[in-house]
Interface confidence: medium
C-alpha cells in the first residue's frame, strides 16, 4: 500500500495505490483511490509510467482524454468512469504485455487540490495447476500441469503424510515454451506415490504462488487448487 500526498502550491489530497501484478495476455488492474470530489467535471486523473514519454491515460471533464496518450498504451486503457466520483481512479489495462511492468504514477487533481502516488506493477504469467493420476505410468505417478508461467517458476512437491520430505529425487519437472515464445507450460511428475495421502504441487515465481492438491484414496480422488499473487509489498 502506498499513500501519496499533494504537491506544494494548492492544498494536497491523499492518493492511495496498491502494488499489483498483471498476467500477460490478459487484462489487469492498477489500483488507485483518492479523496472524492462532489463534481465529476473538477476531477482530472492522469496515469503516467516511468520510461514512457506520453501519458498512459487521462480522464478529465467527465470523460477519457486520449490525445496525449503514449503509443504503447493506445486502445488498451480505461478508467471505471462511473466510480471516479466516489474516488476510484483505478486503471484497467487490456492485453497486459511483459513491457508494461514498471513504476506508474496515479496523479489526481480535484477542486480540493492535487496528489499523487506511485505503484509498482509486475508482469508475468501464472496459472492454476491441475494434478492428476498418470495411469499411463508403470508405477503410481502424479502429473502436475500448469499451462502458462513466466518467469520460470520453481516446482516443489509436498505430502501431508511425509511432511518435510524432499521429493526432488522422485520428481521430474520440465518447462515447455508456448507458441508465443514467452510463457511456458510447466509439467512436473511425481513418482512412487502412496494411496491415502494428500500431495501438493507448489509452483512459484516472484509474481505468484499456486498450489494444486490431490488426495488419492482407494475409492475416490479429490482435487483442489488455488493461486495467490505475491504483490502485497509496501514501499
Amino acid at each position: 500500500l502506498i499513500i501519496g500526498f499533494g504537491i506544494s502550491g494548492r492544498h494536497s489530497i491523499t492518493v492511495t495505490t496498491v502494488a499489483s501484478a498483471g498476467n500477460i495476455g490478459e487484462d489487469g488492474i492498477l489500483s488507485c483511490t483518492f479523496e472524492p470530489d462532489i463534481k465529476l467535471s473538477d476531477i482530472v486523473i492522469q496515469w503516467l509510467k516511468e520510461g514512457v514519454l506520453g501519458l498512459v491515460h487521462e480522464f478529465k471533464e467527465g470523460k477519457d482524454e486520449l490525445s496525449e496518450q503514449d503509443e504503447m498504451f493506445r486502445g488498451r486503457t480505461a478508467v471505471f468512469a462511473d466510480q471516479v466520483i466516489v474516488g476510484n481512479a483505478s486503471l484497467r489495462l487490456k492485453n497486459v504485455q511483459l513491457t508494461d511492468a514498471g513504476t506508474y504514477k496515479c496523479y489526481i487533481i480535484t477542486s480540493k487540490g492535487k496528489g499523487n502516488a506511485n505503484l509498482e506493477y509486475k508482469t508475468g504469467a501464472f496459472s492454476m495447476p491441475e494434478v492428476n493420476v498418470d495411469y499411463n505410468a508403470s508405477s503410481e505417478t502424479l502429473r502436475c500441469e500448469a499451462p502458462r508461467w513466466f518467469p520460470q517458476p520453481t516446482v516443489v512437491w509436498a505430502s501431508q503424510v511425509d511432511q518435510g520430505a524432499n521429493f526432488s529425487e522422485v520428481s521430474n519437472t520440465s518447462f515447455e515454451l508456448n507458441s508465443e515464445n514467452v510463457t511456458m507450460k510447466v509439467v512436473s511428475v511425481l513418482y512412487n506415490v502412496t494411496i491415502n495421502n494428500t500431495y501438493s504441487c507448489m509452483i512459484e515465481n516472484d509474481i505468484a504462488k499456486a498450489t494444486g492438491d490431490i488426495k488419492v484414496t482407494e475409492s475416490e480422488i479429490k482435487r483442489r487448487s488455488h493461486l495467490q499473487l505475491l504483490n502485497s509489498k509496501a514501499s
Epitope: L48, L53, S67, E68, E71, R74, N116
Partner: antibody, heavy 116, light 113 residues
C-alpha cells in the same frame, strides 16, 4: 497563461557543450511533455527530443542520441537541453515547446553559434 | 520514422486570394479509437518561434483567425488561408505527433504576389 522563457544566446567552440534552459510559468509543469526543436539558419524544424518532467522520462531523436541530454527540475519548473561535442552544423536557434495537441506553447528561442 | 512532405515549397498569392498548402505523410496519422488525425500546422514569421495554428488536422488553435482552416485525413492534409492578409506572410510547417520521432514537413513559404 503558460509561458516558456529560455536562456540567452551562446557562442561556443567546436567540441564543447552548451546547456540551454527553459522556464515554465503559469500552469502545471510536471505532467506536460517539454520538447526541444532546433532550426538551423534558413532551414526547417528538427525535433531533438522530449521529457515528461514528473518522471524525468526522456526520448531522443536518433541523430542526437548520445549527444543530447534533456533534464527537468520540477522544483523550479525548468527544463534543460544539453548538447555536447558541438560542431559548426549545430549553429541554430533552439526552441523548447510544450506538447499539448501538437506544440501549443513555444519558448522565444535561444541562438547557439558554434565557431572557432 | 514518418516522413512529412509539403508542397509547394513556396507560394505567391494576391491579397484577398486563397492560399492552399498540401502535406503528405508516409503513413496514416488517423487513430481510429478517437477518430482523430495527429497532425498540426504551424506558422512561423522571421525571428519568431512557430505558432500553433491547427491541431487534430482541422481544429483551430486559440486566437487563430477563421480564415485559416485545415482538412484531410489519413495521409493527405491541406492548410487553406481563405483570404490572404499581409500579416499571413510567413513559412508554414505541418507536423505529425502520431508517434516519435515527431517529424515536420520542410516548410512552405507564403508571399504576396
Amino acid at each position: 497563461q503558460v509561458q516558456l522563457v529560455q536562456s540567452g544566446a551562446e557562442v561556443k567552440k567546436p567540441g564543447s557543450s552548451v546547456k540551454v534552459s527553459c522556464k515554465a510559468s503559469g500552469d502545471t509543469f510536471t505532467t506536460y511533455q517539454i520538447h526541444w526543436v532546433r532550426q538551423a539558419p534558413g532551414q526547417g524544424l528538427e525535433w531533438m527530443g522530449g521529457i515528461m518532467p514528473i518522471f524525468g522520462t526522456t526520448k531522443y531523436a536518433q541523430n542526437f542520441q548520445g549527444r543530447v541530454t534533456i533534464t527537468a527540475d520540477e522544483s523550479t519548473s525548468t527544463a534543460y537541453m544539453e548538447l555536447s561535442s558541438l560542431r559548426s552544423e549545430d549553429t541554430a536557434v533552439y526552441y523548447c515547446a510544450r506538447r499539448n495537441y501538437g506544440m501549443d506553447v513555444w519558448g522565444q528561442g535561444t541562438t547557439v553559434t558554434v565557431s572557432s | 520514422d514518418i516522413v512529412m512532405t509539403q508542397s509547394p515549397d513556396s507560394l505567391a498569392v494576391s491579397l484577398g486570394e486563397r492560399a492552399t498548402i498540401n502535406c503528405k505523410s508516409s503513413q496514416s496519422l488517423l487513430y481510429r479509437p478517437v477518430n482523430k488525425n495527429f497532425l498540426a500546422w504551424y506558422q512561423q514569421k522571421p525571428g519568431q518561434p512557430p505558432k500553433l495554428l491547427i491541431y487534430w488536422a482541422s481544429t483551430r488553435g486559440s486566437g487563430v483567425p477563421d480564415r485559416f482552416s485545415g482538412s484531410g485525413s489519413g495521409t493527405d492534409f491541406t492548410l487553406t488561408i481563405s483570404s490572404l492578409q499581409a500579416e499571413d506572410v510567413a513559412t508554414y510547417f505541418c507536423q505529425q505527433y502520431y508517434s516519435t520521432p515527431i517529424t515536420f514537413g520542410q516548410g512552405t513559404k507564403v508571399e504576396i504576389k
